[in-house]
């Protein structure tokens, strides 16, 4: 707390400007109106404040707005945002999306904080669904930020705005989020002829079923081994050699370096060695011929 | 490409005066504050004097008050601090450089830097 | 605010993680900046709040802390590296910088 001092002689501020620079706290404290601060919060920013000076700013707008700060003042905040808490933003009500971008450029170059998290999360909130625009914007600022919402809040993301992802938004995503975004994905590009769709769909291929990458494999789509590697399992086992073999194409050489590796390893495991053969890589560890393969769980269904 | 120039350094006697200029370039000088910044010979950095992009604010280290004058002008790229009654503890190398912007938020660092003016003060 | 660097010089190899500290007299909230200076040379911008790059500086370059104590890390040491660090608080006026941390070559 700043101690209640009066305000010396002839340092009464009458607008926000340079000649604020070397007033002391308790200066600040008594010489700065509260309402004339919070009308020139545009002029904050052009001034370079220590953060001490803005601690007692933040001081005043907190006492001249207990239940919250209204947009027109938190649009202007700048660096005064970096001290305002989770619990100061909750109490915010941010609908434009230009006080969004205005805030994440001054946290520009930090980690996403909690402040900042809770500012999305509020404006999203506020919103009733992840738009493009927004998405857009955030993915902008923080490439991971898709891959921090839960399954749940994906589910709120509009089909539309799978337009506004990039392959590196998704690179952190685990395959319960993939589950998710792959059928807006398949949904949004829908539209988009074989090697266009193929180049969009990629990077969720990681939430594609078996049916999916089948129909893939008819389409001389060449698939690289790094996005074969982050595929569902469960959706590789069901494909045959030759359908592995179609949807790589020319990287279907890379099977050999990765054999030890999932889904690899557990594909060949499912495949008759016979037909492993084929592909002349030197894969081992396919079902030896003469074997018979029960699909138990095939079996279990029918009962 | 932002570019500071100091010039106006030399030896002085103890007492002396002197006028050292920085010429800005590369960037929008009136926009930015501008700084004086020295370094004693194998010392550390002291923060002399600072103006303000207007020029109508003004500091000084309590070793330079009364002494050191800054100032500005924006209309020439131009800043200047007039050194008087030069001491032997003046002796440094003198930077200009200009305060951090990254539109439209400001903060006290100095982002530019010149190569720097020696000042010897010496008998 | 006094700044207090640690240690004022060190000896190290390329391809060495290197860590210098500053200390502040009192809080300083996150209202730390680290420049290096090269013999001969300016000082240049490598760190402000803290933990912040300043643009086009390599991210082998890091630092942490909040208050009273701050870390400069060069995760591995470079030829290019090898310098004069300083920090410098911009909590409250008059700004002032820390005394120094010469990194040589070993």
């Known amino acids: 707390e700043v101690e209640k001092t009066a305000c010396p002689s002839g340092k009464k501020a009458r607008e926000i400007d340079e000649s604020l620079i070397f007033y002391k706290k308790w200066e600040l404290e008594a010489c700065v109106d509260a309402a004339l601060l919070a009308t020139q919060m545009d002029r904050v920013n052009a001034i370079p404040f220590t953060y001490e000076q803005l601690d007692v700013l933040k001081h005043k707008l907190d006492e001249l707005y207990p239940q919250g700060y209204p947009e027109s003042v938190i649009q202007h905040l700048g660096y005064l945002f970096l001290k305002m808490s989770p619990e100061d933003i909750r109490k915010w009500n941010v609908t434009s999306l230009e006080t969004l971008k205005a805030l994440l450029e001054v946290n520009k170059g930090h980690e996403m904080s909690p402040q900042v998290a809770t500012l999305i999360d509020r404006f999203v909130k506020g919103r009733g669904q992840l738009d493009k625009d927004t998405l857009d914007t955030l993915t902008a600022f923080y490439p991971g930020y898709l891959c921090s919402l839960s399954p749940e809040e994906l589910s709120s993301v509009p089909p539309s705005s799978i337009w506004a992802v990039r392959p590196q938004d998704l690179d952190t995503c685990d395959p319960r989020q993939l589950d998710v975004l792959y059928p807006k994905a398949r949904l949004a590009f829908q539209n988009m002829n074989g090697s266009e769709y193929f180049v969009k769909i990629q990077s969720f291929l990681g939430g594609a079923p078996t049916e999916d990458l089948k129909a893939l494999s008819q389409q001389n789509v060449s698939m690289d081994l790094a996005t074969f590697m982050k595929l569902r399992t469960d959706a590789v086992l069901p494909l045959t050699v030759a359908e592995v073999q179609k949807l790589l194409g020319p990287h279907v050489e890379g099977l050999k370096a990765e054999e030890r590796h999932r889904p690899v390893r557990d594909w060949i495991l499912r495949q008759r060695q016979d037909d492993l053969d084929t592909l002349g890589l030197g894969l081992q560890g396919g079902i030896p011929n003469g074997y018979l393969v029960l699909d138990l769980s095939m079996q279990e269904a029918l009962s | 490409q932002v570019q500071l120039v100091e010039s106006g350094g030399g030896l002085v006697k103890p007492g002396g005066s002197l006028r050292l200029s920085c010429a800005a370039s590369?960037?929008?000088?009136?926009?930015?504050?501008m700084s004086w910044i020295r370094q004693a010979p194998g010392k550390g950095l002291e923060w002399v004097s600072y103006?303000?992009?207007?020029?109508?604010?003004?500091y000084y280290a309590d070793s330079v008050k009364g002494r050191f004058t800054i100032s500005r002008d924006n209309a020439k790229n131009s800043l200047y601090l007039q050194m008087n009654s030069l001491r032997a503890e003046d002796t440094a190398v003198y930077y200009c450089?200009?305060?951090?912007?990254?539109?439209?938020?400001?903060?006290?660092?100095?982002?530019?830097w010149g190569q720097g003016t020696l000042v010897t003060v010496s008998s | 605010i006094q700044l207090t660097q640690s240690p004022s010089s060190l000896s190290a190899s390329v391809g060495d993680r290197v860590t210098i500290t500053c200390r502040a007299s009192?809080?300083?909230?996150?209202?730390l900046a680290w420049y290096q200076q090269k013999p001969g040379k300016a000082p240049k911008l490598l760190i402000y709040?803290?933990?912040s790059l300043e643009s086009g500086v390599p991210s082998r370059f890091s630092g942490s802390g909040s208050g009273t104590d701050f870390t400069l890390t060069i995760s591995s040491l470079q030829p290019e590296d090898f310098a004069t660090y300083y920090c410098?608080?911009?909590?409250?006026?008059?700004?002032?910088f820390g005394g120094g941390t010469k990194v040589e070559i070993k």
């Open positions: 450089a200009s305060g951090w912007i990254r539109v439209p938020l400001r903060l006290p660092l100095f982002q530019h």
């Open positions: 590369g960037f929008t000088f009136s926009d930015y504050y």
């Open positions: 709040d803290a933990s």
């Open positions: 103006i303000s992009s207007s020029g109508s604010t003004i």
């Open positions: 009192q809080g300083i909230s996150s209202a």
């Open positions: 410098q608080q911009f909590n409250s006026y008059p700004l002032t």
